[in-house]
């Protein structure tokens, strides 16, 4: 009997929402208010995450899932699942240890976070520069000067794309 | 999962000319720049450049500027780093590492590397 | 151009506190980051802007940073521990790292 009992754990009959208590002789509870578990079988819910201060709730929390955050408006998610919240800047700024700072000149940012970047050397990589950078935006390359033959009609380019948005996967 | 997957090891002979990828999974592509770092062979690290995968803008180490081209295939979700005139020096273990978020410029993820042998 | 400095190695026996600084100018105006690396696998991010730790990285790697030093400082040291420390940080045109520091837990 006793080995029978030990390959059928009881606990893991125990739903998702519900954990093994072991005060009630193993049954299945439902989780207390405020907790969570996500897989069968636990022997205790989680606690649910609360979105507090410059963290606001983007998910509430069920018997089966945690809470998820997001920030209030002026700051941005940081780290796996949000677990910061950043200031932003205006694009063309940068965030430092000192509060936002403008690009200097040759650097951009066309984000409300992440760093001022130099524009793109398109010479380095072959090409020529079809739209010049400010501080909001890379420059735009082209073909390289070679390929550009005299007359030839001069097409305005598209706006260059945003640079990578780091939304959470 | 997020994973980084570059491409085998390589033999290249001086003044030649070699092409490495670093093909991601698991995460928006465009969404990250793309860095190069290498390792020489009991050395530390050594940044080369980064690709912005939306735009294809880069920025190259000073040191390597005119030698080394970073490009990428968005279609295919890989990056790539082209160093050419290859010389003894270049060998080293190559890692492309994807750019983390916010300010300051973290290195979150990084491939498994590609060591690439320069002989003569 | 940015210089960082670290000390080549550090040792430390188990259970205890290994301190690894890296050096530069001003380096607390700057965020820096930290990487182990074992042998023969890729660097690992373990600290980010300052003190900040990725999903999954124990709470005994923990960062400082002010004035012309940063600090990785590992606590209740492990056997597992034993790698290569790298410091990084962002100098306005391109990414610097440390020389790296050797941890051997004796």
């Known amino acids: 009997f006793e080995r029978t009992r030990s390959l059928q754990d009881p606990c893991s009959n125990c739903p998702a929402g519900t954990f093994c208590d072991n005060n009630r002789n193993q049954i299945c509870s439902p989780c207390p208010p405020n907790s969570f578990s996500s897989a069968g079988g636990q022997r205790t819910c989680d606690i649910c995450r609360q979105c507090k201060g410059v963290f606001r709730t983007r998910k509430e929390c069920s018997s089966t899932s945690n809470a998820e955050c997001d920030c209030t408006p002026g700051f941005h998610c940081l780290g796996a699942g949000c677990s910061m919240c950043e200031q932003d800047c205006k694009q063309g700024q940068e965030l430092t240890k000192k509060g936002c700072k403008d690009c200097c000149f040759g650097t951009f940012n066309d984000q409300k976070r992440g760093i001022c970047r130099p524009w793109t050397n398109c010479s380095l990589d072959g090409k020529s520069v079809l739209v010049n950078g400010t501080k909001e935006r890379d420059v735009v390359c082209g073909p390289s000067p070679a390929d550009l033959s005299p007359g030839a009609s001069s097409v305005t380019p598209p706006a260059p794309a945003r640079e990578p948005g780091h939304s959470p996967q | 999962q997020m994973q980084l997957v570059q491409s085998g090891a390589e033999v290249k002979k001086p003044g030649a000319s070699v092409k490495v990828s670093c093909k991601a999974s698991g995460y928006n592509f465009a969404g990250y720049y793309m860095h190069w770092v290498r390792q020489a062979p009991g050395q530390g690290l050594e940044w080369m450049g980064w690709?912005?995968?939306?735009?294809?803008?880069?920025n190259y180490a000073q040191k390597f500027q005119g030698r080394v081209t970073i490009t990428r295939d968005t279609s295919a979700s890989t990056a790539y780093m082209e160093l050419s005139s290859l010389r003894s020096e270049d060998t080293a273990v190559y890692y492309c590492a994807r750019e983390g978020e916010g300010r300051g410029l973290d290195l979150d993820w990084w491939g498994q590397g590609t060591l690439v042998t320069v002989s003569s | 151009s940015y210089e960082l400095t670290q000390p080549p190695s550090v040792s430390v026996a188990p259970g205890k506190t290994a301190r690894i600084t890296c050096g530069g100018n001003n380096i607390g105006s700057k965020s820096v980051h930290w990487y182990q690396q074992k042998p023969g696998q890729a660097p690992v991010l373990v600290i980010y802007y300052d003190s900040d730790r990725p999903s999954g990285i124990p709470e005994r790697f923990s960062g400082s940073n002010s004035g012309n030093t940063a600090t990785l400082t590992i606590s209740r040291v492990e056997a597992g521990d034993e790698a290569d420390y790298y410091c990084q940080v962002w100098d306005s045109s391109s990414v610097v790292f440390g020389g790296g520091t050797q941890l051997t837990v004796l």
């Open positions: 690709v912005n995968p939306q735009s294809g803008g880069t």
